[in-house]
């Protein structure tokens, strides 16, 4: 019916408008509507100036798309001609009175389907479905994946590729790991994964400055040092450094008028020369304060060597020894006077005889034929040495013995000389003068060793070799190398080292091969004025301890191995040190302070003398320890 | 739409051969990846076999309890994948899926064609 | 080889209860995947990379795990949801699947 009548409107507008000119009257006669009608007519009026005679030619010049008047009166009721729709949104247009309709193609919206719907901003359908990226797209959308992702299927959901899997040579020689949207080349610690190479490298974290004082990369990792031997240790942050500090204080103070006679390990502390009148005789006077058993006092000879006297200690007594022309004497005698305490000693010629005695109290005589020395132009010359003799006397005394003396004299008074001069020489030489007070043991101040040769095998045991070590040990501060066995090649397959515990106060001991910690016992408090006990037993098999708490044998996986490596260098051939070590690397052991305190050593039934080493730093003191410092009332 | 669908199955001898063909469409063929899995009440899902796309050279990988009896082969150019099966055993009985795979997993799966070996 | 044991082999649940179901794996990986399968149809992968869920999958599922241990949850069971599912990953060039969980409506 409609179209009945659209077609019925056509004709009458052909009839009253195209074949004849029509008013806006007649025109509203064939629409019938006022809508339509204002619509038409104006339009009309524009088609007929544009074909009105004379202009015909002119406006198909023109930008008229009519080619005739007919055409162009036709068209203008239908308002989807020229099409309202945007051309890519709309479906169909559809022509109404006066108006449009255009529908649009899904994704379009808008009178003329001109706008586009933002399909990725849809409330109803977050991110339009997609599980990534929403794309828009001019009346569409798409969904796309971020790098290292795969679409599936169903065009919405993006998946993870698995790098890994995918390609498994894409890392080389390093762990691949698979994380979303991308891989890792996963190196062990202390390694960097290399793209050229696609394999790890160590990090050189030496180069990167890691440690305070001394570092040592190796395969993994790094390991810092601080130098013991000036006093420092590694720090808990295992990067810095930090002083050993004392954990408990000793009374170092010393007095000029006293000479220490171990200053040096080697050699004579004090050497004096006296040219006196002939009717001189030899004297000496002294207090004497020792807890050593044997070494010089003092020995004096003739100018010309010829006659000497030697006043020694042996087995904590006073010996004798003298030769000169008319004789050749060795006298032992007295009281042991090795007990710390201070002893008047005095030796004096006598026309007849020696006289020794000690605390006033004659001890022995020594006959003699003539004079002790010989004087010669009318002078007696006598040299005297305090705490050894030249060396070439060694091979002419009577009986040998092992010059080495830890003790101080003091009041001395030689070839009835008094003190003169000596004291003034004394003075100026700090490591001449003597600790005030001390007790029994040795001393090690922190600052050097000593080196013993031990012979730990035991042909008669099936384990070959075995070291039995009891320490009697006052530290004076926490962490320092009290006993290490070292190879030819500069490694230490054994010490025992102490260090301050990770707890207040308290200090651990570290039983070590190489560089390894075979095991550690802590926590114990080490650092006070009483001796602590500590017992090891090592043989190729066991390692046996006690402390002052428990007595345990050691085993664990490891220490067999370990164990191993200790045994193959006992084979061959060890040197002993106490108190610290030698110039072996840092990273030859887990400490390399020297150790600070006091401490006897007893190895294999043997109690170790210092005075017996094959070296020893001058600061050892082998029989006399600093007493703990006492914090008085005024200090 | 991405659709796969299996043909050729069927009831063979033990000791015999058989051809599964698959055709699919709705998606970009020579980029994938296409493998076959089975289903038996016995086994449950079983992978069988895995052809990858041009790029990855036309790759194949199989599963242990196939490798030597079974052949996976694609045409790029009718996007069809085959399974060719000698050797057939009873335990290889079943419903054989083609899918597509997509990185790793199985992303679209065919309604699947029956394999009866007996005797 | 890597072996997928998926427990337990068959649970019933009531609708709107909690319901979870494991896959063990004996040896770590990095994904897992989740396949529904209804009577008479094929398998859907429903779960993929250890918990994202296919497009148009509910959201009262969800898949979580890693290493050797991995599990499919829902939150409320529906009628709908009573399927068996199976578990599924890869590793050295091999698929592997689980035997599968048959979750039945009370």
């Known amino acids: 019916a409609n179209s009945l009548l659209e077609e019925t409107k056509q004709g009458n507008l052909e009839r009253e408008c195209i074949e004849e000119l029509c008013n806006k009257e007649e025109a509203r006669e064939v629409f019938e509507n006022d809508p339509e009608t204002d619509y038409f007519y104006p339009k009309y009026l524009v088609c007929l100036r544009s074909f009105q005679t004379g202009l015909f030619t002119a406006a198909r010049q023109s930008t008229n798309a009519y080619p005739d008047l007919r055409s162009c009166v036709n068209a203008i009721p239908d308002q989807c001609s020229p099409l309202p729709c945007n051309e890519d949104g709309y479906m169909s247009c559809k022509d109404g009175k006066a108006s449009f309709t255009c529908t649009c193609k899904p994704g379009w919206q808008g009178e003329k389907c001109e706008f586009d719907i933002n399909e990725c901003k849809d409330p109803s359908n977050i991110n339009g479905g997609c599980s990534q990226i929403c794309d828009n797209t001019p009346g569409s959308y798409h969904c796309s994946c971020k790098n290292g992702f795969v679409m599936l299927s169903n065009k919405k959901d993006c998946k993870d590729v698995d790098e890994c899997s995918l390609k498994p040579s894409i890392c080389g020689t390093a762990v691949c790991k698979n994380i979303p949207g991308d891989f890792e080349c996963e190196c062990p610690e202390g390694y960097r994964y290399n793209l050229k190479s696609k394999s790890c490298e160590d990090i050189d974290e030496c180069s990167e400055n890691m440690c305070a004082q001394l570092c040592v990369n190796y395969p993994g990792g790094y390991t810092c040092y601080c130098d013991g031997k000036k006093g420092f240790k590694l720090a808990q942050d295992q990067k810095s450094c930090e002083v050993v500090s004392v954990c408990l204080p000793l009374n170092l103070d010393t007095k000029y008028e006293l000479l220490y006679l171990a200053e040096q390990f080697a050699g004579v502390v004090l050497y004096l020369k006296f040219r006196l009148p002939e009717i001189s005789r030899f004297s000496a006077e002294f207090d004497f304060r020792t807890y050593d058993s044997e070494g010089v006092i003092l020995y004096a000879e003739s100018i010309d060597h010829s006659a000497w006297l030697l006043i020694a200690l042996r087995g904590g007594k006073i010996e004798v020894q003298l030769k000169n022309e008319h004789t050749s004497k060795i006298t032992t005698g007295g009281d042991v006077i090795n007990n710390g305490l201070w002893n008047m000693v005095s030796v004096e010629e006598l026309e007849h005889s020696i006289s020794i005695k000690i605390a006033k109290e004659a001890v022995m005589d020594i006959n003699k034929p003539g004079p002790l020395f010989k004087p010669e132009n009318g002078l007696l010359e006598t040299k005297v040495y305090f705490a050894g003799f030249p060396r070439k006397v060694e091979s002419e005394l009577i009986k040998p013995i092992n010059p080495r003396l830890d003790g101080c004299i003091r009041s001395w008074n030689l070839m009835k000389q008094g003190a003169s001069g000596i004291k003034e020489i004394i003075q100026e030489k700090q490591n001449k003068h003597c600790l005030v007070t001390v007790e029994k043991g040795s001393y090690y101040p922190g600052s050097g060793i000593a080196q013993f040769h031990i012979d730990y095998n035991n042909v008669s045991s099936a384990e070959g070799w075995h070291v039995n070590v009891t320490l009697n040990i006052r530290p004076s501060t926490g962490t320092g190398v009290m006993l290490a066995l070292v190879s030819g090649n500069n490694t230490v397959p054994f010490a025992v080292s102490l260090v301050d515990s990770t707890s207040e106060k308290s200090q651990d001991i570290l039983l070590s091969v190489e560089n390894t910690v075979i095991y550690r016992i802590q926590a114990l408090s080490l650092c006070s004025d009483q001796q602590s006990h500590l017992e090891f037993r090592v043989n190729r098999n066991n390692l046996e301890l006690s402390t002052p708490l428990k007595i345990e044998t050691i085993s664990h996986e490891d220490l067999q191995r370990q164990l191993a490596v200790l045994d193959k260098a006992m084979k061959a051939k060890v040197a002993t040190y106490l108190g610290g070590l030698p110039d072996v690397p840092f990273s030859a052991t887990p400490v390399n302070a020297f150790y600070n305190g006091c401490m006897e050593v007893n190895i294999n039934g043997v109690q170790l003398d210092l005075d017996e080493a094959i070296s020893k730093h001058n600061d050892i003191r082998a029989h006399s320890c600093p007493s703990v410092w006492k914090k008085t009332k005024n200090s | 739409e991405v659709k796969l669908e299996e043909s050729g199955g069927g009831l063979v001898q033990p000791g015999g051969s058989m051809k599964l063909s698959c055709a699919a469409s709705?998606?970009?063929?020579?980029?994938?990846?296409m493998d076959w899995v089975r289903q038996s009440p016995e086994k449950g899902l079983e992978w069988v076999a895995e052809v990858r796309s041009k790029a990855d050279n036309h790759a194949t990988y199989y599963a242990e309890s196939v490798k030597g009896r079974f052949t996976i082969s694609r045409d790029d150019s009718k996007s069809a994948v085959y399974l060719q099966m000698n050797s057939l055993r009873p335990e290889d009985t079943g419903i054989y899926y083609c899918?597509?795979?997509?990185?790793?997993?199985?992303?679209?799966w065919g309604q699947g064609t029956t394999l009866t070996v007996s005797s | 080889q890597i072996a997928l044991t998926q427990s337990p082999a068959i649970m019933s649940a009531s609708p709107g209860e909690k319901v979870t179901m494991t896959c063990s794996v004996n040896?770590?990986?990095?994904?897992m995947h989740w396949y529904q399968q209804k009577p008479g149809s094929s398998p859907r992968l429903w779960i993929y990379d250890t918990s994202n869920l296919v497009s148009g999958v509910p959201g009262r599922f969800s898949g979580s795990g890693s290493g050797t241990s991995y599990s499919l949850t829902l939150s409320s069971m529906e009628a709908e949801d009573a399927a068996t599912y199976y578990c599924q990953q890869y590793s050295g060039y091999l698929y592997t699947f689980g035997g599968g969980t048959k979750l039945e409506i009370k």
């Open positions: 709705g998606f970009t063929f020579s980029d994938a990846w």
């Open positions: 899918t597509l795979t997509t990185a790793f997993l199985f992303d679209s």
């Open positions: 040896s770590s990986v990095s994904y």
